[in-house]
């Protein structure tokens, strides 16, 4: 006999989450970013895979490729080229890192309703692109970068050189691509295609990281990626520029690189063109605290890109690295000379300043104890911008407009009051002249995006609510979700707290720590998800909490450049005081505690366990650095400098998880890392294990063959249910 | 349901000019971009020249100079000013929207340039 279920109680029918909720993506969102293509029109791909074309003006829309033409060829991706007469369609998607790929192209020739045929492209191809104006083709193969003057041309072979880990045109190596640009390309057209600049790296003299590939073979494969790591020899990077029109009259003229960075090892960063004849380039030096803007005019007489002294731009950082995770790229106003950019203001706030001769001589065009975020657009009259000024939560995002054709200009926040309880996270996507433009919320809320009349910033239509989702979990017991702030020592430590669905502050909770710690990063942010930790809220009944501490990005340099040459130490100091602070709220079991995090989260879990606090009873490291000598040049050196003697090698030896291997005897620790991680390589987690094997330490271990740094496909679920047992065992929770 | 319906054109001497028209139906013209397009005996269609929804026009480089897109908003009606035109200009020139549908052309006008 069973009881009956009472229909009228809402608990009743109500469900917690589970794991398999999580591995299965049910209660994954859709966002909505128009394919613009004018300053009124956009492509989207719908449901079943028509391409679409939206006129808003209208409210028209008709298909200009058929999902059957897209079937045809397996295509996953495509990209008009803008007059309108060609589509190229991607298939064969390849994956190489995090941005890079390789893939087959096919032209579709809308005017005729067929493929182009004669002449295609050879396969795989790394990188393709139409130029901004007509249908001429830059793309790269086998390192080398081709140009067509029309889809069905014979290409002209612009780069010789390229060759497979060597020398990379138009595309970067490992360390620019993810670290530096980072994009899966590196090449640039002018606005009007009269020009293509491109980078060439030469990566000849970089030591080799090599790893076995198991696959299925008798013998396993070895992968071999030129990677510089810390210390190590870095890439040589050298940009040239190519007129499109007569690519064989005076060929690539190479763009001079500023004396004051030539004179040492250099990164290139971003390049910028501002007119057809007039680009702007960026440039670091190895010890990433000098940045140099650079823009260069063509001399029609030469032939030759002119970099005079008095059009560079030096930005400096007295106190950390320059600009924040990367340093940041201008925004060119319509007189093709001055730029807006973001950097420090005198506070040590990223603002946005106005730069028309020289740095010394900028505008600051916004201000406050908060940071301005991105530039979207800069139009005739309006500067869009993000911040996180609004009610003092930097981990909020609203979109702004500084009317800039005015004096004094006047702001207004476009976003603050749209959705105010679902929505406090944005980012925008403009049309041409920012006609109009797509907002897209990322919570707290279920997500939305919509779409806006540019000149009055009126709502139009709605683009994507996630109906489906909000349907699904309306029968679902999510956990509750604060984020708040500690004042400990002149320091605010912001945190989000996850918390189970009937919390009930009397009650005694295990308490996860989520952590990741790295330098310009921030995980307290006001953005929606359904994910692990939410499972182990809403089912397992415990309390997750992340904390942003000292490192961490968009509060000011003061807490950003804190971890400056100290990586490892204020990072796991912060989460051990934030703790401390959680067992004082009074709703913590102090003996079920336990931190994980993955890659820098890795990192500073593998030392807070190793802390010698008692705190912790468990942790999880997926895929940690273990020493900064291990990890890339690019990345580390901007935080930590050299490992030499004369620099900061003390501290990269003293920072390291193997040096603290006694620590781990009174926790348990479990340790994950795929075999073929390209980023942080296995290496790091191959020398925890050995440390805590020679020091006689015990502790659990899972590696996952033949994957990188995601871990992901099936590795993801048997992940997730690994640290799911882990964590119920530590915690003491039933199966 | 949008209707295209092209006409003025005929047989011109090469240095000669005509003006295509194009009568547009269930759509407005001016705010839609529209192109004209032209094939040729034996070979493929291509775009001549497009008319954005606000001002701006693409030519194909062979008619740069020659030929001008316009229209006409209150006649709902697309133009095209055909001028200097030589004996490769001899083709079938539609009107249609700009990029095309997949699956829409009208019955076009023929242009012969004789020289």
């Known amino acids: 006999l069973r009881p009956s279920r009472v229909h009228n109680s809402e608990e009743n029918t109500m469900r917690a989450l589970t794991l398999k909720d999580i591995l299965n993506g049910t209660f994954s969102y859709k966002t909505f970013f128009p394919n613009w293509i004018s300053g009124q029109e956009y492509l989207h791909q719908s449901a079943d895979n028509n391409i679409v074309l939206y006129n808003i003006e209208t409210g028209q829309s008709y298909t200009i490729l058929s999902n059957r033409t897209m079937k045809s060829v397996n295509a996953s991706n495509y990209g008009l080229s803008p007059d309108r007469q060609f589509v190229y369609l991607e298939s064969d998607y390849s994956k190489l890192w995090r941005y890079s790929y390789t893939a087959t192209y096919y032209i579709y020739d809308l005017s005729n309703g067929e493929f182009v045929r004669g002449n295609e492209l050879p396969r795989p191809i790394q990188y393709l692109c139409w130029s901004p104006v007509g249908s001429k083709l830059a793309y790269v193969y086998q390192n080398n970068i081709y140009l067509k003057q029309r889809p069905g041309d014979p290409p002209f072979q612009i780069t010789f050189n390229g060759r497979e880990n060597k020398i990379f045109n138009g595309i970067p190596d490992w360390v620019y691509e993810e670290e530096m640009l980072p994009t899966k390309y590196a090449l640039w057209w002018s606005p009007n295609g009269k020009f293509l600049a491109y980078a060439e790296f030469n990566d000849k003299d970089i030591p080799v990281i090599a790893y076995s590939y198991y696959g299925d073979e008798q013998y396993p494969r070895t992968i071999n990626i030129p990677y510089p790591k810390a210390g190590a020899k870095n890439p040589v990077v050298r940009i040239f520029i190519i007129d499109t029109t007569y690519p064989a009259y005076v060929g690539p003229q190479e763009v001079p690189v500023p004396a004051m960075i030539a004179s040492s090892d250099y990164y290139f960063s971003w390049l910028t063109w501002v007119t057809d004849e007039r680009v702007c380039l960026q440039w670091l030096k190895r010890v990433q605290n000098v940045s140099v803007l650079s823009i260069c005019d063509f001399r029609e007489d030469w032939q030759t890109w002119d970099c005079p002294k008095t059009q560079e731009h030096i930005e400096e950082s007295r106190t950390g690295w320059a600009g924040g995770f990367f340093v940041s790229r201008p925004v060119f106003s319509y007189d093709a000379i001055s730029y807006y950019k973001i950097f420090s203001d005198k506070d040590g706030y990223k603002h946005i300043h106005y730069i028309k001769d020289t740095v010394e001589n900028a505008i600051q065009i916004t201000s406050g104890k908060w940071e301005a975020i991105n530039i979207f657009r800069v139009t005739q009259d309006s500067l869009f911008y993000s911040s996180n000024e609004f009610e003092e939560y930097p981990g909020r995002r609203n979109i702004y407009r500084i009317s800039i054709g005015s004096y004094p200009p006047s702001k207004k926040c476009v976003t603050c009051h749209l959705r105010k309880e679902r929505c406090q996270y944005y980012t925008a996507s403009f049309s041409d002249y920012a006609k109009y433009y797509a907002l897209v919320c990322y919570g707290p809320g279920i997500p939305i995006s919509t779409l806006h009349d540019g000149r009055t910033d009126q709502e139009i239509k709605i683009l994507e609510e996630n109906k489906e989702l909000e349907n699904a979990l309306k029968n679902i017991q999510l956990p509750k979700e604060e984020i708040k702030k500690l004042e400990v020592d002149e320091i605010t430590l912001w945190y989000k707290m996850i918390l189970p669905p009937q919390f009930d502050r009397s009650k005694k909770y295990p308490l996860l720590i989520q952590v990741y710690g790295g330098p310009c990063s921030q995980s307290v942010r006001s953005v929606f998800a359904v994910n692990w930790i939410s499972y182990l809220a809403s089912k397992e009944g415990m309390v997750i909490a992340l904390v942003d501490g000292r490192g961490t990005a968009f509060q000011g340099d003061k807490l950003l450049y804190a971890v400056y040459r100290k990586l490892g130490v204020y990072e796991v100091e912060d989460q051990i005081t934030a703790v401390r602070k959680f067992i004082e709220m009074g709703f913590i079991d102090e003996k079920r505690i336990a931190i994980w995090g993955w890659s820098y989260g890795g990192y500073v879990s593998s030392l807070a366990l190793a802390s010698g606090t008692g705190l912790f009873k468990c942790g999880i490291a997926v895929a940690p650095v273990s020493s900064w000598e291990y990890y890339a040049s690019v990345y580390t050196e901007r935080f930590m400098g050299l490992p030499t003697k004369d620099d900061n090698l003390e501290h990269y030896k003293n920072s390291t998880v193997m040096a603290r291997a006694e620590y781990f005897r009174n926790v348990d620790y479990l340790l994950i890392h795929g075999t073929a991680d390209d980023n942080v390589h296995f290496q790091n987690s191959a020398q925890i294990a050995k440390a805590l094997v020679n020091a006689q330490v015990d502790f659990q271990a899972m590696w996952y063959s033949d994957q990188n740094h995601g871990l992901s496909g099936l590795s993801t679920n048997h992940l997730y249910t690994h640290m799911t047992h882990f964590l119920k065992q530590c915690f003491s929770l039933s199966d | 349901q949008v209707q295209l319906q092209e006409s003025g054109g005929g047989l011109v001497q090469a240095g000669g000019s005509l003006r295509l028209s194009c009568a547009v139906s269930g759509i407005i013209s001016s705010m839609n971009a529209m192109g004209w397009y032209r094939q040729a005996p034996g070979k493929r269609r291509e775009l001549v020249a497009g008319?954005?929804?606000?001002?701006?026009?693409t030519y194909a480089d062979a008619v740069k100079g020659r030929f001008t897109i316009s229209r006409d908003n209150a006649k709902n009606t697309l133009y095209l000013q055909m001028n200097s035109l030589k004996p490769e200009d001899t083709a079938v020139y539609y009107c249609?929207?700009?990029?095309?549908?997949?699956?829409?052309w009208g019955q076009g006008t023929q242009v012969t340039v004789s020289s």
């Open positions: 249609n929207r700009w990029p095309p549908p997949y699956d829409y």
């Open positions: 008319l954005g929804s606000g001002v701006s026009t």
